[in-house]
C-alpha cells in the first residue's frame, strides 16, 4: 500500500484553522487478518531520511494521537486529550486521514508526518509516512486564508478553514 | 504517566510452569505492542517476542515459540507470558516493553526474576 | 536472523572523557536501530532511536550515528552516572535482536 499527500506545503495565516490530510491505498484484505495503526507528529528533513524523527505535536506524541482499526473503518483521536490542545485527528472509510489544527501560531510552522503501519498477524509491520510543510505567517505578506499547494505540478488551492 | 507493572519474582522447580504479568497504566493499552524480553546473567538481551493486545497478533522468536505462550486481557490492561517445562536455561529476569507500532520499545518493565531450581 | 555485533564488552573510560560504543548489524538495516542502556539493578531505557535521534529527556551528551550496518553510539563527555551497559537494536524485521552489550565502566 501507498500514502500519498494531496499538498506538499500549506500556507496559512496566524490565528487560522488548517486541516492537513493523507491518503492511504491499494489492497485492503477485508478479513480480520490486518489492522491499520495511522498517527502524525513534526519531524525535521533528515540527512538519511524525511520523518525519521518524532517530535510532538503541541506537546501531543505520535502515540496520543494515534489511529488504530482495522480496514477501511473510520475512527477518531481521544478528543478530549488532543482537543484540549486545538488538535483532532480522524479517518473516514475511504483511507483519507487528517489532522486539524485549530488558531495557529508561528510556532506551528514546520515538517509535519503521516504515518501509516500495516500490521498482520505473525508478519513484520509495513510502515508508510507522507510528508508536507506547514508555514504559518503573520502581517501583511500572509494570506487571508490558508493556501495548499499540491504535491504535483497541479495549481495551488484556497482551502477552507476547518 | 506511562508504566508496566510486573508481578513479582518466582522461584520454580524444573518441569513446572509460570505465568508472569505486565500490567500497563497511562496509555492505550491496546494500541500498543507488549514485547517480552529474556535477560540471563551475562547474557545480554534476547526477544522472546509480542503480542498486539485487543487483536491479539503474536511474533514469537523461534526459539523460544515452544517455551513461551502470550496472552492479554484488555479488561485489566494486562499481558501475561507462560512459560512451560521449567529448566536452569529458564532461569532469568523477564522484561515487559512496551512498543507502539512502528517503533522502539519506550517503556520498560522493571523486570519478573525467575529461578528454577530442585 | 540479524545479527548485532558489539565489538567491545568492556570500556574503561575517565570522566570527562569521550567515548564511542560500535555495533554492526549482519544486513542493511537503513536507520532503523536504538541504543538502550541499563544501568546496575535496573531496566533498560531507550536513549536513541532511528540511529541518531534522542530519546524524550535524554541529555545531548549522548548522540548516535550510521547507517546500513555500521553504527556509533557516543557519549561526548562521560558522567559518573553513565556507568552502565549499553544495546544496540535493530527494529528493521521481525524476530528484533539486540547487539551483546557494551559494559562502560569509570575509571
Known amino acids: 500500500f501507498k500514502v500519498a499527500t494531496l499538498y506538499s506545503l500549506y500556507v496559512c495565516p496566524e490565528g487560522q484553522n488548517v486541516t492537513l490530510t493523507c491518503r492511504f491505498f491499494g489492497p485492503v484484505d477485508k478479513g480480520h487478518d490486518v489492522t491499520f495503526y495511522k498517527t502524525w507528529y513534526r519531524s525535521s528533513r533528515g540527512e538519511v531520511q524525511t520523518c525519521s524523527e518524532r517530535r510532538p505535536i503541541r506537546n501531543l506524541t505520535f502515540q496520543d494521537l494515534h489511529l488504530h482499526h482495522g480496514g477501511h473503518q473510520a475512527a477518531n483521536t481521544s478528543h478530549d486529550l488532543a482537543q484540549r490542545h486545538g488538535l483532532e485527528s480522524a479517518s473516514d472509510h475511504h483511507g483519507n486521514f487528517s489532522i486539524t489544527m485549530r488558531n495557529l501560531t508561528l510556532l506551528d510552522s514546520g515538517l509535519y508526518c503521516c504515518l501509516v503501519v500495516e500490521i498482520r498477524h505473525h508478519h513484520s509491520e509495513h510502515r508508510v509516512h507522507g510528508a508536507m510543510e506547514l508555514q504559518v505567517q503573520t502581517g501583511k505578506d500572509a494570506p487571508s486564508s490558508c493556501v495548499a499547494y499540491p504535491s504535483s505540478s497541479q495549481e495551488s488551492e484556497n482551502i477552507t478553514a476547518a | 504517566q506511562v508504566q508496566l507493572q510486573q508481578s513479582g519474582a518466582e522461584l520454580m522447580k524444573p518441569g513446572a510452569s509460570v505465568k508472569i504479568s505486565c500490567t500497563a497504566t497511562?496509555?492505550?493499552?491496546?494500541?500498543?505492542?507488549i514485547e517480552w524480553v529474556k535477560q540471563r546473567p551475562g547474557h545480554g538481551l534476547e526477544w522472546l517476542g509480542e503480542?498486539?493486545?485487543?487483536?491479539?497478533?503474536?511474533n514469537y522468536n523461534e526459539k523460544f515459540k515452544d517455551k513461551a505462550t502470550f496472552t492479554a486481557d484488555t479488561s485489566s490492561d494486562t499481558a501475561y507470558m507462560q512459560l512451560s517445562s521449567l529448566t536452569s536455561e529458564d532461569s532469568a529476569v523477564y522484561y515487559c516493553?512496551?512498543?507502539?507500532?512502528?517503533?522502539?520499545?519506550?517503556?520498560w518493565g522493571a523486570g519478573t526474576a525467575v529461578t528454577v531450581s530442585s | 536472523d540479524i545479527v548485532m555485533t558489539q565489538s567491545h564488552k568492556f570500556m574503561s573510560t575517565s570522566v570527562g572523557d569521550r567515548v564511542s560504543i560500535t555495533c554492526k548489524a549482519s544486513?542493511?538495516?537503513?536507520?532503523?536501530i536504538a541504543w538502550y542502556q541499563q544501568k546496575p539493578g535496573q531496566s533498560p531505557k531507550l536513549l536513541i532511536y532511528?540511529?541518531?535521534y534522542r530519546f524524550t529527556g535524554v541529555p545531548d551528551r549522548f548522540t548516535g550515528s550510521g547507517s546500513g550496518t555500521d553504527f556509533t553510539f557516543t557519549i561526548s563527555s562521560v558522567q559518573a552516572e553513565d556507568l552502565a551497559v549499553y544495546y544496540c537494536?535493530?527494529?528493521?524485521?521481525?524476530?528484533?535482536?539486540f547487539g551483546g552489550g557494551t559494559k562502560l565502566d569509570i575509571k
Open positions: 497511562g496509555y492505550t493499552f491496546s494500541s500498543c505492542w
Open positions: 544486513q542493511d538495516v537503513s536507520t532503523d
Open positions: 516493553a512496551r512498543r507502539p507500532p512502528g517503533w522502539y520499545f519506550d517503556v
Open positions: 503480542i498486539l493486545p485487543g487483536s491479539d497478533y503474536t
Open positions: 532511528s540511529a541518531s
Open positions: 537494536q535493530h527494529q528493521y524485521s521481525t524476530p528484533w535482536t
